[in-house]
Structure formats: structure tokens, C-alpha cells
């Protein structure tokens, strides 16, 4: 007569994180008396998942009623699966014994693989702003996915980037994985409205990739161009001199007028106008009382933009 066999019909089971895994097991006999136990892993370090005889296993339910006479179905369901549950599960028949039950026969094992979605990609740029023509690095990170296979792409304004490096960790077997990618982007003066996008595609996303974005407005600094011009005389002894501050970003800007090197007035850009490319223009003027000067006057428009060293433009005012 054949002795009891423990049958685990499924070599592997694939379950999405958060769902319930069903691990199937049947015995061919009710002999010997003793419980079925489920373990994850083999050997002395194996983890007890369920014991028919005793214990409390809140995540585990049996598929059939084990108190029913003649029941030989020892399949279990494990709820709320996470990547940490991945592994090989063994259905093991024990024989009633004193002082402890004795392992009698084990099933061949069922490998539980957990499909876990990657977290939303987080894109981060450089800590400090950079100016056009400079190359800056952006990083993209996503975590907690399984299996390991994943695709990451970079885009700038819809155009795919090619200068990037990607790593998936760890290299060996793990319950879940992380991806880290660094892309290099060359800034242009038109990038205030630009976006850098990191796109992650994974089997769990069913063809709908996750995206993380970074706005280059947080990375770029476009320094202003200055132009100082003298307007026609407004009154008998007053001259209006304007300083045109053009194409700058961000808005944070302070302007100082100097008359022959002496500070005349300082102001902060407030009512700026915005260009189509996202940069700003601003104009400041200075009324100079010509009669107060016997000699020619050197007028300087000095601009400090976004905490950077000041740039200036001068204009010589002739006193006739």
C-alpha cells in the first residue's frame, strides 16, 4: 500500500502586491495522524507560516474546512501579499509524536513571486542653479518593484535623451528592487518652460508607465542683458536715463544707479513683464538734474541678479 504523498501542484505562483496568494496542497492519505504545517524556505532557518494544530496566523486562511472529516486539502490563502513574502513555500505533513511531532513528508514546494509596482519616480535636479550652455545632472529614483526587469527613459520636452546612466539594485536576488538613473542635460536660454521627464515602465503597470518630472525653471538661471539709454530732455535741466534689463530668470533682481560712482538709488524689480520664453524684462529710469553738475556725469546701472555678482552698464551724460 502506498504511503502518504504531499502534492503541491503549482511549481510557482505569481501574485500582485496587496492581493491574496493561494498555495495549493493535498495529501493522498489521512494516515498518519498529525498536522500539516506550511513553511517558507527549507532547512533549520525555515519560517513557520501556518500550523494546523496550533497557533495564531492572522494572514492565513485555509481553502477548505480542516475540521471536516476526510479532508485532505491543505491549501492556504495568504492575504495582503508584499514583496517580503516572496520565497518557496513547503507544505509539510507531520506525524503525531511525543514530545514533539515528527516531520513525515514534504511537498516539492511552490515558489511565490510577488509582482510589486514601482513607486512614483522622483526626479531631483542640481542643488544650485546653472546658466545656459552648462550641463546639469538630474537623478530619478523609483523603489519597491518586483520582478527586477524595468525600463527607464528620459525626455526633455518630449524629446528622448540619450546621455544617462541607470542602475538597478541589488544586483542579486531580492524581494524587491530600486532603480537609480542620472541624466545629463545641456541648458539653453529657452529652457525656463522646459520639463525633464523620467518615465518608468514595468510589467505591473500594464503599459501605462509612471512619470516623474522636474521643471527646468527650478534649475536654470538666465542672466540679464543691460542697455542704458538717454531720453530727450524732459524739462529745462532734467535728463531721463533708462536702464533696460532684458531676458532674465528668475525674477529676483536688484538694481542700483550710480552717479560718478556714488549710489543714487537702489530698487528691486517688481512690475516686470514676462516674455514668451518665460524670461522677464524690466526697466528703470533715473532723472538727472543737469544743472547740479558742472562736469560730465558717468551714470552706471548696476544689477545684482539672483544673488550673483553684479553686472553693470554705464552711460556718459554730457553737460554742455
Amino acid at each position: 500500500e502506498e504511503e502518504l504523498q504531499v502534492i503541491q501542484p503549482d511549481k510557482s505562483v505569481l501574485v500582485a502586491a496587496g492581493e491574496t496568494a493561494t498555495l495549493r496542497c493535498t495529501a493522498t492519505s489521512l494516515i498518519p495522524v498529525g498536522p500539516i504545517q506550511w513553511f517558507r524556505g527549507a532547512g533549520p532557518g525555515r519560517e513557520l507560516i501556518y500550523n494546523q494544530k496550533e497557533g495564531h496566523f492572522p494572514r492565513v486562511t485555509t481553502v477548505s474546512d480542516l475540521t471536516k472529516r476526510n479532508n485532505m486539502d491543505f491549501s492556504i490563502r495568504i492575504g495582503n501579499i508584499t514583496p517580503a513574502d516572496a520565497g518557496t513555500y513547503y507544505c509539510v505533513k507531520f506525524r503525531k509524536g511525543s514530545p514533539d511531532d515528527v516531520e513525515f513528508k514534504s511537498g516539492a514546494g511552490t515558489e511565490l513571486s510577488v509582482r510589486a509596482k514601482p513607486s512614483a519616480p522622483v526626479v531631483s535636479g542640481p542643488a544650485a542653479r546653472a546658466t545656459p550652455q552648462h550641463t546639469v545632472s538630474f537623478t530619478c529614483e523609483s523603489h519597491g518593484f518586483s520582478p527586477r526587469d524595468i525600463t527607464l527613459k528620459w525626455f526633455k520636452n518630449g524629446n528622448e535623451l540619450s546621455d544617462f546612466q541607470t542602475n538597478v539594485d541589488p544586483v542579486g536576488e531580492s524581494v524587491s528592487y530600486s532603480i537609480h538613473s542620472t541624466a545629463k542635460v545641456v541648458l539653453t536660454r529657452e529652457d525656463v518652460h522646459s520639463q525633464v521627464i523620467c518615465e518608468v515602465a514595468h510589467v505591473t503597470l500594464q503599459g501605462d508607465p509612471l512619470r516623474g518630472t522636474a521643471n527646468l525653471s527650478e534649475t536654470i538661471r538666465v542672466p540679464p542683458t543691460l542697455e542704458v539709454t538717454q531720453q530727450p530732455v524732459r524739462a529745462e535741466n532734467q535728463v531721463n536715463v533708462t536702464c533696460q534689463v532684458r531676458k532674465f530668470y528668475p525674477q529676483r533682481l536688484q538694481l542700483t544707479w550710480l552717479e560718478n560712482g556714488n549710489v543714487s538709488r537702489t530698487e528691486t524689480a517688481s512690475t516686470v513683464t514676462e516674455n514668451k520664453d518665460g524670461t522677464y524684462n524690466w526697466m528703470s529710469w533715473l532723472l538727472v538734474n543737469v544743472s547740479a553738475h558742472r562736469d560730465d556725469v558717468k551714470l552706471t546701472c548696476q544689477v545684482e541678479h539672483d544673488g550673483q555678482p553684479a553686472v553693470s552698464k554705464s552711460h556718459d551724460l554730457k553737460v554742455s
Partner: antibody
Framework: RQLVESGGGLVQPGGSLRLSCTAS????????ISWVRQAPGKGLEYIGT?????ITYFASWAKGRFTGSKTSSTAYMELSSLRSEDTAVYFC????????????WGQGTLVTVSS | DIVMTQSPSSLSASVGDRVTITCQAS????????LAWYQQKPGQAPKLLIY???TLATGVPSRFSGSGSGTDFTLTISSLQPEDFATYYC???????????FGQGTKVEIK
């Protein structure tokens, strides 16, 4: 679905007897068959369980004198070195206890040990 | 070996009465629930009523119930019927597979 015992009768002290337990309507292959006896006017006494091969066990008082075997349809129990105190009705039942309790039972067969 | 002590050894009751029989094990039964109750009528084989301490066997009326864990167990008949007059046995299993012992029985008689 029933069990029928046979093989009981009168046997002299020191003698042997082979009891049979035959299943009809179901197979014994995935179940143990347990034997229980009841001396006249007394309570029930567990003897042992016949499983497969190595999975056959008897109460400590029955070891050595009682042995058993089983096919898919019939279980056997061999009684040897019989004594007068072994006089009893011998029942067989399907099951090995715990989550496989004794059910159904045979009608019993009387073994009388007397000279 | 495990020893099962049943009480009372006999009782007299009327139809409709609630009857309680107890069974005490000398040590915790296997899995704290290896306890079955059987009913036997004169000249008949025993019949399974309850197993795993509290699981009602198929076809057994719901007036029979079992409770308990470890060493102390109870069989309750909520409303005694004429066909319930019989002898009741508990069967407890110890940790060894051959360690199965019946209680001495409780005879339920008509008052």
C-alpha cells in the same frame, strides 16, 4: 458505507486468532483502521491503529501480543498469547483519531478466551 | 499514558432536561483539542457525536454540543430526547499517536 468484522469465536488461553474488518462502499487506502474492545459489562478500550507499513501502532498494553495489517478493502488484527481477560467484543472503526475520529464502526465480533 | 476521567458515572434525567457530562484529562490532550465523544446503546457499536472537542459529526442533532480545551471538556445535551438514553464515552488523545484513552463512560438513564 459500512465495516463488518469477522473471525471472532472461542479460543483457548495462549491461543491465537485473526480478526478481519472488511469495508464496503469505501476504500481503506487513505484511512487508518482502529481497533477498540469492550469486555462484557465494561467500558471501551483502545487497542491500536492499522495504517500503512510503518504506520501501525498499539497501546502499550497491547504491544507484542497484537499485530495488524491492511489492504485497500480489509484490515486484519492478529491476537496471540490470548488470556481470559482478553474476552471482549472487538470493534473496528475507520479513523486514526484527532482530526480523523473513529467513524463508522463495525458491529463488533465477540472473542471468548476460555479453556 | 493519558488518563481520562468522566463524571458522573451515571445520571438520571427526564425528557427535555439539559444534561452535562464532563471529561478531565490527566494532561493536555494533543493540540488541546484531541477529544471526541461517542454514544453507545446496549448491543450496538459506538456512534461518533463530537470530535476535535467541539465539531459536530455529520448527521448528529444540534442539541448535542461539545466544549473545552486542554484538560477539561464538556458534552452538553440541550434538551434530552427519548432516543438519547445511552452511555456516553469521551476519547482523549495524548501526544503519542498510540496514546488514545476512553473515559469510563457515563450512563444516562430515565428518571
Amino acid at each position: 458505507r459500512q465495516l463488518v468484522e469477522s473471525g471472532g469465536g472461542l479460543v483457548q488461553p495462549g491461543g491465537s486468532l485473526r480478526l478481519s474488518c472488511t469495508a464496503s462502499g469505501f476504500s481503506l487506502s487513505s484511512h487508518g483502521i482502529s481497533w477498540v474492545r469492550q469486555a462484557p459489562g465494561k467500558g471501551l478500550e483502545y487497542i491500536g491503529t492499522i495504517g500503512t507499513g510503518v504506520i501501525t501502532y498499539f497501546a502499550s498494553w497491547a504491544k507484542g501480543r497484537f499485530t495488524g495489517s491492511k489492504t485497500s478493502s480489509t484490515a486484519y488484527m492478529e491476537l496471540s498469547s490470548l488470556r481470559s481477560e482478553d474476552t471482549a467484543v472487538y470493534f473496528c472503526a475507520r479513523g486514526s483519531a484527532w482530526n480523523d475520529p473513529f467513524d463508522p464502526w463495525g458491529q463488533g465480533t465477540l472473542v471468548t478466551v476460555s479453556s | 499514558d493519558i488518563v481520562m476521567t468522566q463524571s458522573p458515572s451515571s445520571l438520571s434525567a427526564s425528557v427535555g432536561d439539559r444534561v452535562t457530562i464532563t471529561c478531565q484529562a490527566s494532561q493536555s490532550v494533543y493540540g488541546n483539542n484531541d477529544l471526541a465523544w461517542y454514544q453507545q446503546k446496549p448491543g450496538q457499536a459506538p456512534k461518533l457525536l463530537i470530535y476535535l472537542a467541539s465539531t459536530l459529526a455529520t448527521g448528529v442533532p444540534s442539541r448535542f454540543s461539545g466544549s473545552g480545551s486542554g484538560t477539561d471538556f464538556t458534552l452538553t445535551i440541550s434538551s434530552l430526547q427519548p432516543e438519547d438514553f445511552a452511555t456516553y464515552y469521551c476519547l482523549g488523545g495524548g501526544d503519542d499517536e498510540a496514546d488514545n484513552t476512553f473515559g469510563q463512560g457515563t450512563k444516562v438513564e430515565i428518571k
